[in-house]
């Protein structure tokens, strides 16, 4: 279950640990945010740091230099090593969940592909301390609500399997 | 049961200014964003924008940039839109709409409608 | 901004046939909301996500639909749903109506 104690905010891998290429984003959020979304980037997966980096900088380099966009579209990304990896952090928009979501939520990525397998507990408890984490720091409202990629756009992530978990989690409401 | 109670009909000279309220009642008025929507005699609806009474964020059609402007007072619970340089083409009602808590573009409570009527 | 045209702009049905209208766009969208509005009346949330009917709604309505080309239909009509019907999208900047079709009883 999804915890909201935020005694301890997990440390997050840093930009420059994963040797991000530098943002050219400007467009600031407007904290604290009412919306989470949750998506998988479809692609591989990574169970350790150094494959995670790696991962996390394939996305950024899709993004970046096939889609043109101004840094990597998520604002972080999940790891299966349990750990998060900051993409566009708590304070820049992400292109994430199209142009009228973007601007009012947080984008979170698991990197992998889970259509039909849930991430490791690792990564979710990653994730979940994360949501916690941006409560306690303000920049999620007490209150926000989580929803599923595929609950804003027309998609299959997060993946069938992911989309059931997070459909468990006391913060996710439909429509 | 959640009420979206507007003010009453206006009846404005062109040139003249106006502002429409809408108050909420039986629900946590910052928790949802308040729409508004423009509805011409016989005609469609159009959106003119929305507001976030939580901190004041606010987003407009362009169509309606600088013609209308929202703002919201937490201690009353209450939206206001202001619509002003009036002209005949701005005689409509005009909604004011929450939006769903869990997807903020489903217009869930619509409130009873402001007749706005512009004329010599 | 994106364009939905309705049609039929008019339809009149019998208690008990199967009414259908639909809601044609100018370019792809994710979902589609549907609103019912009655004379004098302000118009009242009817269908979202494209096929989801919120609380009140009778099972005998339903949405279906996908990319451009969107549809509400009644199983049996009755009489009280004699009213004008808009399609909404949010997928784009400025959200968009349709410009209603008007449903009357026979």
């Known amino acids: 279950q999804e915890t909201e104690d935020p005694a301890c905010c997990s440390p997050i891998v840093p930009r420059n640990e994963w040797k991000a290429l530098a943002s050219e984003c400007a467009q600031h959020l407007s904290l604290p945010l009412r919306y989470v979304v949750v998506s998988h980037t479809a692609g591989s997966s990574c169970n350790t740091p150094a494959s995670c980096q790696q991962q996390a900088r394939n996305v950024q380099h899709y993004h970046m230099k096939t889609l043109g966009w101004c840094d990597v579209g998520y604002n972080f990304l999940i790891g299966e090593d349990g750990l998060v990896y900051e993409g566009r952090g708590w304070n820049f928009t992400g292109a994430h969940s199209g142009h009228l979501w973007n601007p009012m939520s947080i984008g979170i990525s698991f990197m992998g592909n889970y259509m039909d397998r849930v991430p490791t507990p690792q990564a979710i408890r990653a994730a979940q301390g994360l949501l916690a984490c941006g409560v306690a720091q303000g920049a999620l409202r007490s209150n926000y609500v989580l929803k599923g990629h595929r609950d804003v756009q027309r998609t299959l992530s997060p993946g069938n399997q992911l989309y059931h978990l997070i459909q468990n989690w006391p913060h996710y409401r439909s429509p | 049961e959640i009420q979206l109670q507007q003010s009453g009909p206006e009846l404005v000279k062109p040139g003249a200014s106006v502002k429409v309220s809408c108050m909420a009642s039986v629900y946590s008025f910052t928790d949802y964003n308040m729409y508004w929507v423009k509805q011409s005699r016989g005609k469609s609806l159009e959106w003119i924008g929305y507001i976030d009474p939580y901190n004041g964020d606010t987003s407009y059609n362009q169509k309606f940039k600088g013609k209308a402007t929202l703002t919201v007072d937490k201690s009353s619970n209450t939206a206001f839109m202001h619509l002003n340089s009036l002209t005949s083409e701005d005689s409509a009602v005009y909604y004011c709409?929450?939006?769903?808590?869990?997807?903020?573009?489903?217009?869930?409570?619509w409130g009873q409608g402001t007749t706005l009527t512009v004329s010599s | 901004q994106i364009v939905l045209i309705q049609s039929p702009a008019i339809v009149s049905a019998s208690p008990g046939e199967k009414v259908t209208m639909t809601c044609s766009v100018s370019?792809?969208?994710?979902?589609m909301y549907w609103y019912q509005q009655k004379s004098g009346t302000s118009p009242k949330r009817w269908i979202y996500d494209t096929s989801k009917l919120p609380s009140g709604v009778p099972a005998r309505f339903s949405g279906s639909g996908s990319g451009t080309s969107y549809s509400l239909t009644i199983s049996s009509m009755e009489a009280e749903d004699a009213a004008t019907y808009y399609c909404q999208q949010w997928t784009s900047n400025p959200p968009t109506f349709g410009s209603g079709t008007n449903l009357e009883i026979k």
């Open positions: 370019s792809s969208v994710n979902y």
């Open positions: 709409i929450r939006g769903d808590y869990g997807n903020p573009f489903y217009l869930d409570y």
